[in-house]
Amino acid sequence: WELTILHTNDVHSRLEQTSEDSSKCVNASRCMGGVARLFTKVQQIRRAEPNVLLLDAGDQYQGTIWFTVYKGAEVAHFMNALRYDAMALGNHEFDNGVEGLIEPLLKEAKFPILSANIKAKGPLASQISGLYLPYKVLPVGDEVVGIVGYTSKETPFLSNPGTNLVFEDEITALQPEVDKLKTLNVNKIIALGHSGFEMDKLIAQKVRGVDVVVGGHSNTFLYTGNPPSKEVPAGKYPFIVTSDDGRKVPVVQAYAFGKYLGYLKIEFDERGNVISSHGNPILLNSSIPEDPSIKADINKWRIKLDNYSTQELGKTIVYLDGSSQSCRFRECNMGNLICDAMINNNLRHTDEMFWNHVSMCILNGGGIRSPIDERNNGTITWENLAAVLPFGGTFDLVQLKGSTLKKAFEHSVHRYGQSTGEFLQVGGIHVVYDLSRKPGDRVVKLDVLCTKCRVPSYDPLKMDEVYKVILPNFLANGGDGFQMIKDELLRHDSGDQDINVVSTYISKMKVIYPAVEGRIKFS
């Protein structure tokens, strides 16, 4: 018996087609992805093949103005229109709190939403009961397939699930649910989830009875043969893991942003054992036409986005200096504002010992592309912020050693004075540079805000200590010459859309007045 698994993950509100780098579509003839194009390909496969499942491994939420405006209603609507068969909860599904998951998505989805390792407690338990499930048995042709879900146990550090959801260890939580499916005579089981490729492989290895793992969170691109675009494969598709009980378990993921549709064909014997597996992600490029009815629906929903862009988010009573002569040379208050917003967006009081899990932000000055003038009645709009942050990135959480951070700050001023973009703006950091010293030895003081403290204060950076830092994905990927970050980071979790982080902060504060306050000094 043959099953076709179509899968997406980490779509991050890319409902419309995008450029090849998953930012806003500029040249339509070269654009990719989007739900209208995805639907065309899915329907094509459904018509051609008998047993097809369309699955999503989480993180539909967060990433573009679509999510900012529609808050998840767009996800339910278009996933329903595409007739997804199941979805696993990702960490970003909790970005607007549990209510922001329940109302727009859980209550509106016409497909099961899954996670076996999230347990509700207290008053939430009855409120959320039945709205998401640990597993679901789906009829496919003449057979049944069990889908069991999982979500990163780091979600409390990455999003806003509140205090009434417990995120258990994935493997510990999955095993009893898979055992339950086995007792129900379900012998074909897919683990669908959002914990990253390393955990996907562990699940394939450790959870007895799982036949296939469909993952997300790490934006992993797997491919067999010559890759069709610029993503470099992390391994073959499917990636085969030998389980502890000797089975060959295929593990797949389909990069991110709806650029590819994962396509995996599995052949099972009559006892539900995987005989063979093969496939590849399908690049959703412009050779695949956008479905006209879905496209028309997208255009209808788009109207509200254009109106939103010019609405006031909040006010500034000071000039927000995003000029290159400030932000690429010294501390600028636009950099301070953005870094403060980045930290505020990551406030998670998950442990009594820590006032917060992260206190530091770094931001390349070259990423700031416009000032905002307070003399326009102080009004700040999404449109204004899109000029400040025009490149459509995310603000991510990384873990770095102190020694890596020191290298990053040396890099910040290694060729100071040429208006180059690597000059770092900061939050939760006090740095002093001496430009009379030779490049690579210019940081004379580097103090960082403690996290394991009840009264936050600045302490000298320790070279061997591991620190959490919020920074643009551009820096996490080694941009502006920050190769040391890319090479030495110990963990990287992708975060929220840059503009969304700042707009949320401004809306929350209502009136802002960031100052230049001595975060960056020159001796």
């Epitope: 290159s324 002569q325 592309r369 416009s370 000029a387 490149f391 060729r415």
Partner: antibody, heavy 117, light 105 residues
Amino acid sequence: EVQLVESGGGLVQPGGSLRLSCAASGFTFSSYDMHWVRQAPGKGLEWVAVMSYDGSNKYYADSVKGRFTISRDNSKNALYLQMNSLRAEDTAVYYCATEIAAKGDYWGQGTLVTVSS
Amino acid sequence: IQMTQSPSSLSASVGDRVTITCRASQGISNYLAWYQQKPGKAPKLLIYAASTLQSGVPSRFSGSGSGTDFTLTISSLQPEDFATYYCQQSYSTPHFGQGTRLEIK
């Protein structure tokens, strides 16, 4: 569709002046640092000048310093190159180009400047 | 900072593996880009940050190096690859190499 269209090239006598323009469309012009690059007939590429996205920083190649001035008007999505005291060795196709940013870079198709008596 | 490319010209056949090198007169970290130019056309960005492939550029192109020595490699030459290639540093005010003309053997 991203477009950069250069204009203003032509024949000019040594010592003369010319103003090149570059009209940008299809992208957020005010977010990008902009460059002028030139190519003499049958020769290689030579970088000429750059201006930051907000116009606050400008840098020039030594060969044009003091003679050429780069400017921009973000309200008009336009980049300019004022060329004074032109010499025969300034004869080239002049390209305007964006910085290499998140999406790579964009180039115009060039405008030919000929300095000859 | 001066950029020296070698060779200045190169003859090769379709299917060949080709390597072009670029040397900076002083260390430029990874602030290096590679461009392809065809006659009468504007240059086209292939690689930036020494090794990052630009969107839409075939994966047969790759870049490597850091500091002063850099390499552009075309793993299997295609007919459309015959052109002139330039390296460019952006560590200080930008500077191009003198170019490498890649011709059909």
